[in-house]
Interface confidence: medium
């Protein structure tokens, strides 16, 4: 009386896990336990199943899988190795799985892996070789072309002693392996800064969103050699101004859209190149949005409508004459 | 016909160990993961353990997680129950269970049981 | 743990009447999908038999009198006219996650 289910929809399976690979295959219409399959559309989800670990019973046909909303905690090294090895899967959705430790070699095995998503997990521990896979100083190229990293950041009072910042760029950087990335999300992650190696270190880049963070600067970060950038997001930074450098580099990049709403422009005499270029370029997404934050008397402005006479600078009193 | 006999039970005392089988027969064993359910005297049913049909993956109850180990051999068509430091709360018919490999439709066929019988 | 509410406890219907056995989960048991809710019948001495699938899938050989609807957290197992050979205690479960769990069971008696 065992049921049949056509290839076209979801089939399923369903409870519980340990060991690690699998010494047989798992037999080709076999759909891990607590999971959803459709070998039809090479798709395998189990999500919101409180998943501790990976299933290790995974199908070889798995294209796309959906691990979210699970409690996995630590994805080991070689977490998605199978014997045979899951070479068609591309694209892995790992979000809001309660993952807090990444190791090296996590991804490994994994030769088609085109897309992984870590988003809203609170990684305390991202291996620098979690995506590279080897501690070596020039690794073999990863398959990523989208790594999806938003709102990674673990609560501040589980943060090791290091630069949130430096642990997600050692992993970026690491053996050169992200050569071919061409999408990088980093969106609401609280970085302060952007360690100005990082970008110069993937070439390939179309699209970055470093959205929703706390930026105050891009004074040190370099865009020039991103000649395939197509979309920079800084939506909800903390940025006060862009300089003639940043202007200029942005200005270079001959397929840029850049996005700039909801940043806390000064508008001094600081934010005079920048409203001049504004008031020319094409990049800016939304230009008329952008609006003045300070000085108290200039908020809300729009800065397209603002001319040099708008923008003043206090002059600086000498040490004589200031007050506390 | 599919059919499931479960044996090895038995009466038993606190601290000691069983041992029980579940012979399989009128399908290919190994193609279904399978369960361990139990029914304490005069109780209802609480789901034991799980082993997929290639030995891969393994889910316990946390009352027998440590305790339990679930196996199976596919050359003998045969499920195993290994139960160490048993305890008078482990008094229960334990039934095996088969799956099918798609796993949203319940546990399809049952064995009669065995019965285990903790007590000093 | 997902927690299996069933009601009521014992049920008493006369012959040929409908009897109906209602079964909360604490969470959604149901994807977009599926509903991964299952129900057995048990008779004294015998081990359960499942009779509905999926919440609502017949097993094959049980009689069209029975009955499973419902999705998320509630479910319903409908007899819609009770025969003697229907005595027996009913159960729900589910296989949405680890640990599976069961309903406490219904009693069904001929009135």
């Known amino acids: 009386s065992s049921p049949t289910s056509s290839a076209s929809s979801f089939s399923s399976s369903a409870p519980f896990l340990a060991s690690a690979v699998s010494a047989q295959p798992p037999l080709p219409d076999q759909c891990p336990a607590l999971c959803e399959c459709s070998e039809a559309a090479r798709t395998v989800k189990c999500v919101n199943r409180n998943l501790t670990e990976v299933p290790t019973d995974l199908p070889a046909y798995v294209r796309n899988l959906f691990l979210t909303g699970n409690q996995l905690a630590v994805l080991p090294a070689g977490a998605f190795a199978r014997r045979p090895p899951l070479a068609e899967l591309a694209a892995l959705n790992l979000s809001g799985s309660r993952l807090d430790e990444v190791r090296a070699g996590a991804f490994e095995h994994l030769p088609s892996l085109r897309q992984l998503d870590l988003s809203h997990n609170p990684l305390a521990d991202l291996s620098p070789f979690a995506f590279s896979g080897s501690n070596a100083s020039v690794s073999a190229p990863s398959p990523l072309v989208e790594l999806i990293l938003n709102h990674i950041v673990p609560p501040e009072d589980e943060r090791q002693n290091r630069s949130f910042e430096g642990m997600v760029v050692a992993a970026l950087l690491a053996g050169r392996a992200l050569q071919g990335l061409r999408r990088l999300e980093l969106a609401s992650n609280h970085f302060l800064y952007l360690p100005r190696d990082v970008l110069a270190q993937l070439p390939s880049l179309r699209h970055l969103d470093l959205s929703n963070n706390s930026l105050v600067s891009l004074t040190y970060v370099s865009f020039r050699n991103l000649t395939h950038l197509e979309s920079l997001h800084l939506e909800d930074n903390a940025l006060k101004v862009l300089h003639n450098g940043t202007l200029a580099e942005l200005q270079g990049l001959p397929h840029i859209r850049v996005f700039l709403d909801n940043n806390p422009w000064v508008c001094d005499c600081h934010m005079a190149d920048m409203v001049t270029w504004l008031k020319e370029t094409e990049v800016v997404q939304g230009k008329d949005r952008l609006t003045c934050a300070y000085p108290e008397k200039m908020r809300n402005r729009v800065l397209l409508e603002l001319n040099s006479a708008d923008l003043d600078c206090d002059p600086i009193l000498p040490p004589s004459l200031q007050t506390s | 016909e599919v059919q499931l006999v479960e044996s090895g039970g038995g009466v038993v005392q606190p601290g000691r160990s069983l041992r029980l089988s579940c012979a399989a027969s009128g399908f290919t064993f190994s193609n279904f993961g399978m369960h361990w359910v139990r029914q304490a005297p005069g109780k209802g049913l609480e789901w034991v353990a799980y082993i997929s049909s290639g030995s891969s993956t393994f889910y316990y109850a946390d009352s027998v997680k440590g305790r339990f180990t679930i196996s199976r051999d596919n050359s003998k068509n045969t499920l195993y129950l290994q139960m160490n430091s048993l305890r008078a709360e482990d008094t229960a018919v334990y039934f095996c269970?088969?799956?099918?490999?798609?796993?949203?439709?319940?546990?399809?066929?049952w064995g009669q049981g065995t019965t285990v019988t903790v007590s000093s | 743990d997902i927690v299996m509410t069933q009601s009521p406890d014992s049920l008493a219907v006369s012959l040929g009447e409908r009897a109906t056995i209602n079964c909360r989960a604490s969470?959604?048991?149901?994807?977009?999908?599926?509903?991964?809710m299952h129900w057995y019948q048990q008779k004294p001495g015998q081990p359960p038999k499942l009779l509905i699938k999926?919440?609502?899938n017949l097993e094959s050989g049980v009689p069209d009198r029975f009955s499973g609807s419902g999705s998320g957290t509630d479910f319903t197992l409908t007899i819609s006219s009770l025969q003697a050979e229907d005595v027996a205690v009913y159960y729900c479960?589910?296989?949405?996650?680890?640990?599976?769990?069961f309903g406490g069971g219904t009693k069904v008696e001929i009135k």
């Open positions: 479960q589910h296989s949405w996650e680890i640990p599976y769990t």
């Open positions: 269970a088969r799956s099918p490999a798609y796993y949203r439709y319940g546990l399809d066929y």
């Open positions: 969470q959604s048991v149901s994807s977009s999908t599926f509903s991964y």
């Open positions: 999926s919440s609502s």
